[in-house]
């Protein structure tokens, strides 16, 4: 689709005559039709396949055309077409006289011819005017022609349409050759797709509009190519998002854990013991005469209760003193100014003379002892049972009960509570004091993993203690924000545990 | 072949929201926007926005922005409508497209929402 | 709002020539794009900015655009023409999206 322009300029018949060779009366009253047809070697009369069009009367005799851009007498004269322009033409122009004041040139008679001149050949679109002039006995025609697409069209032969635009469905310019060119910033087959800030990650980023960089959930940074570790992971690192590889040195679920804590900050005091291990990350042994977590309390000297025979001990500056019951002496009371005619054995114990009856011992029955058989034994004096055990007399013996997760004798042995695979759909397990927690993959909940996440991942109110719960990018992931105090991917771990 | 899969018919009371599915395969996803268009009974097809499934960009037809989301999940191929505060003019049939340089060249097969008290 | 209006109806014998015309103020600068739905069907694309043809759509069916006028020309209506179209563009800005009316062709 195009439009031939043809520019009419200068027309001259000085003795203003017709073709016929008849004089106008009072002069020529020029007015112009125009013939564009397909390229004929030979032009012939015929329908104008490209076009046609009439001038009103533009001068007399000779005269000079000028422009003009709207109304009657436009000029240049514009002859649209709606095909693809096939790069060669003919055109007759011819010039005739109208005798009278009607300016409507169809009324003209058939023998008012001034001069016709034809052109054939080939012609380029182009915005450059080709111009030209014809000469002949009696006349001369100057003109300039020139083929343009119409808007919207573009090519060598104005059929390639184009039609640019810059809203959501594209941005683009065309090109002359009618091709799209994208506006800065925007790529795709229609340019409809944003060119992200350079070096944004391809996977991980993603952007809305030119030279941003949006980060997909689990990654950060200005080129979104840092991952997020673990909420609450303290000492470590992620080579894929949510992950914590602990740093040397470090240990536990969210690398919380000095795996040397003893030589980074010596807690142990008084010449105590340290290592590398209990809950806190270290343990510390005290010497005889100390307590305490970090063996930071000296025992009073009579802890370890010296005084015999119910003689009451006094701490004294670096030593202690037993205050003897009457019939007893001694430094710890352990003499004894009693003989068995004193009966002095409690709860059935037996006396037996000692020294030639200057002296006892106390033969005491079972669950009795003392020098006087005046203490009833408690077995569980010691703190016999390990692990938090609850010591227990019974008779002659006595037992301990476990707490739950251990088990022996003294309640030593550890019970793992995932060796019996408690996790459903691939959880991992975690042995905690109070049973075994599971941590769940993508798609499944529940304390053991068992129920199968259908559509919101956040429904089933994955999160613990409180922990507020988002869904990912797909509907099956969510992540959880956990309140102070926990960590873990579901905030089901207190700080502190390991 | 590219096909697009809607979700079934929905009957839903006026003032509660609706969401319809768009389930898209044989092709790449991400390349291509989603449109969505409507048409009541008897009446003329009505557009009611586009989203881009590459980066969630949106555009909403004027009349519904209020009340219309769309939404695309890359990681199943899946974009998304959901229009809240029902009426009874809203009773029509849903239907998503796949958009290339404004052109709509695969339709899904349309999804009945009736809204009726 | 922006507007395409479109005759709610066009008649035709099978074997004439069917126009559909489609005008809004922004077809000279913004595609025209038509749409063929058939009774309790999807609508197809047959033709693409103004005057494209998909592949797959019969060669009768031509597009063209002049001034703020699109017209859709089924050349040599079949039976199976019979069916409502659609025309959809964008306004100026290229925010509002709309369908014309839609125009039902009755090939009798």
């Known amino acids: 689709s195009g439009i031939f322009q043809l520019r009419l300029q200068e027309f001259v018949n000085q003795r203003g005559m017709l073709a016929n060779g008849q004089s106008c009366e009072p002069g020529c009253r020029t007015f112009f039709r125009i013939c564009l047809k397909h390229f004929q070697a030979t032009f012939s009369e015929g329908p104008c396949t490209f076009g046609n069009v009439s001038t009103p009367v533009l001068g007399t005799n000779s005269f000079v055309v000028r422009d003009k851009n709207s109304g009657s007498g436009r000029n240049p004269l514009q002859l649209p077409f709606n095909f693809t322009w096939p790069g060669t033409f003919s055109l007759n122009i011819q010039a005739w006289h109208t005798p009278g004041d009607d300016l409507r040139p169809e009324t003209s008679p058939g023998n008012s011819l001034i001069s016709q001149i034809i052109i054939q050949g080939s012609l380029a679109v182009g915005k450059i005017w080709r111009t030209d002039e014809q000469n002949d006995t009696l006349t001369r025609l100057s003109y300039s022609y020139r083929v343009i697409c119409s808007d919207n069209y573009y090519g060598e032969s104005c059929s390639r349409l184009c039609k640019k635009r810059d809203d959501h469905f594209g941005h683009y310019e065309c090109q002359p050759d009618g091709s799209l060119s994208c506006l800065p910033g925007w790529t795709g087959k229609y340019c409809d797709q944003p060119i992200c800030l350079s070096g944004c990650h391809e996977q991980n980023g993603y952007c809305s509009k030119p030279d941003e960089c949006i980060c997909r959930p689990g990654w950060q940074g200005r080129l979104c190519n840092e991952c997020i570790p673990h909420n609450g992971c303290r000492h470590g690192t992620c080579s894929i998002p949510w992950q914590c590889a602990c740093d040397e040195g470090w240990g536990g679920l969210f690398c919380d854990q000095d795996l040397n804590y003893c030589t980074h900050h010596s807690p142990c005091k008084n010449g105590s013991t340290c290592s590398n291990s209990g809950p806190k990350g270290y343990t510390c042994t005290c010497l005889p005469g100390y307590t305490g977590e970090h063996c930071e309390l000296g025992l009073s000297k009579c802890a370890s209760n010296p005084c015999r025979n119910g003689g009451s001990c006094k701490d004294q500056e670096n030593s202690y003193h037993c205050l003897c019951p009457p019939g007893y002496y001694g430094q710890h009371c352990e003499h004894s100014t009693l003989t068995c005619a004193d009966s002095p054995c409690f709860n059935g114990g037996s006396c037996r003379e000692r020294n030639q009856g200057s002296s006892y011992a106390c033969e005491c029955p079972p669950n009795f002892t003392g020098s006087n058989c005046e203490k009833k034994v408690d077995r569980c004096t010691s703190n016999p049972c390990a692990n938090g055990g609850q010591c227990q007399n019974r008779g002659p013996s006595r037992t301990c009960r476990c707490r739950p997760g251990f088990t022996g004798t003294h309640c030593e042995l550890h019970i793992s509570d995932c060796a019996r695979s408690p996790c459903a759909h691939g959880g991992t397990c975690h042995d905690l004091e109070n049973g075994p927690v599971c941590t769940c993959p993508a798609g499944f909940s529940g304390r053991r993993c068992e129920v199968r996440i259908t559509h919101d991942a956040c429904a089933s109110g994955p999160c613990f203690n409180g922990a507020t719960c988002y869904t990912g990018l797909s509907p099956n992931n969510f992540v959880c924000n956990c309140p102070y105090g926990f960590v873990g991917s579901r905030c089901e771990f207190p700080v502190g545990l390991p | 072949q590219v096909l697009l899969i809607q979700s079934g018919a929905e009957v839903k009371k006026p003032g509660a929201s609706v969401q319809v599915s768009c389930k898209a395969s044989?092709?790449?996803?991400?390349?291509?926007?989603v449109i969505w268009v409507r048409q009541a009974p008897g009446q003329g097809l009505e557009y009611m926005g586009w989203i881009s499934a590459y980066n969630g960009n949106t555009n909403y037809a004027q009349k519904l922005q209020d009340r219309v989301t769309m939404t695309s999940d890359t990681s199943t191929t899946t974009a998304y409508m959901e229009l809240r505060s029902l009426r009874s003019d809203d009773t029509a049939v849903y239907y998503c497209?796949?958009?290339?340089?404004?052109?709509?060249?695969?339709w899904g097969q349309g999804t009945l929402v009736t809204v009726s008290s | 709002s922006y507007e395409l209006t479109q005759p709610p109806s066009v008649s035709v014998s099978p074997g004439q020539t069917a126009r559909i015309t489609c005008s809004g103020d922004a077809l000279p600068k913004k595609y025209a794009y038509w749409y063929q739905q058939k009774s309790g069907q999807a609508p197809v694309l047959v033709i693409y900015?103004?005057?494209k043809r998909p592949s797959g759509i019969p060669e009768r069916f031509s597009g063209s655009s002049s001034g703020t006028m699109a017209t859709l020309t089924i050349s040599g209506a079949q039976v199976e023409d019979e069916a409502d179209y659609y025309c959809f563009s964008t306004d100026n800005s290229g925010d509002h999206s709309v369908f014309g009316g839609g125009t039902k062709l009755t090939v009798l």
């Open positions: 044989g092709y790449t996803f991400t390349n291509y926007g």
């Open positions: 900015e103004d005057i």
């Open positions: 497209a796949r958009e290339l340089g404004s052109s709509f060249d695969y």
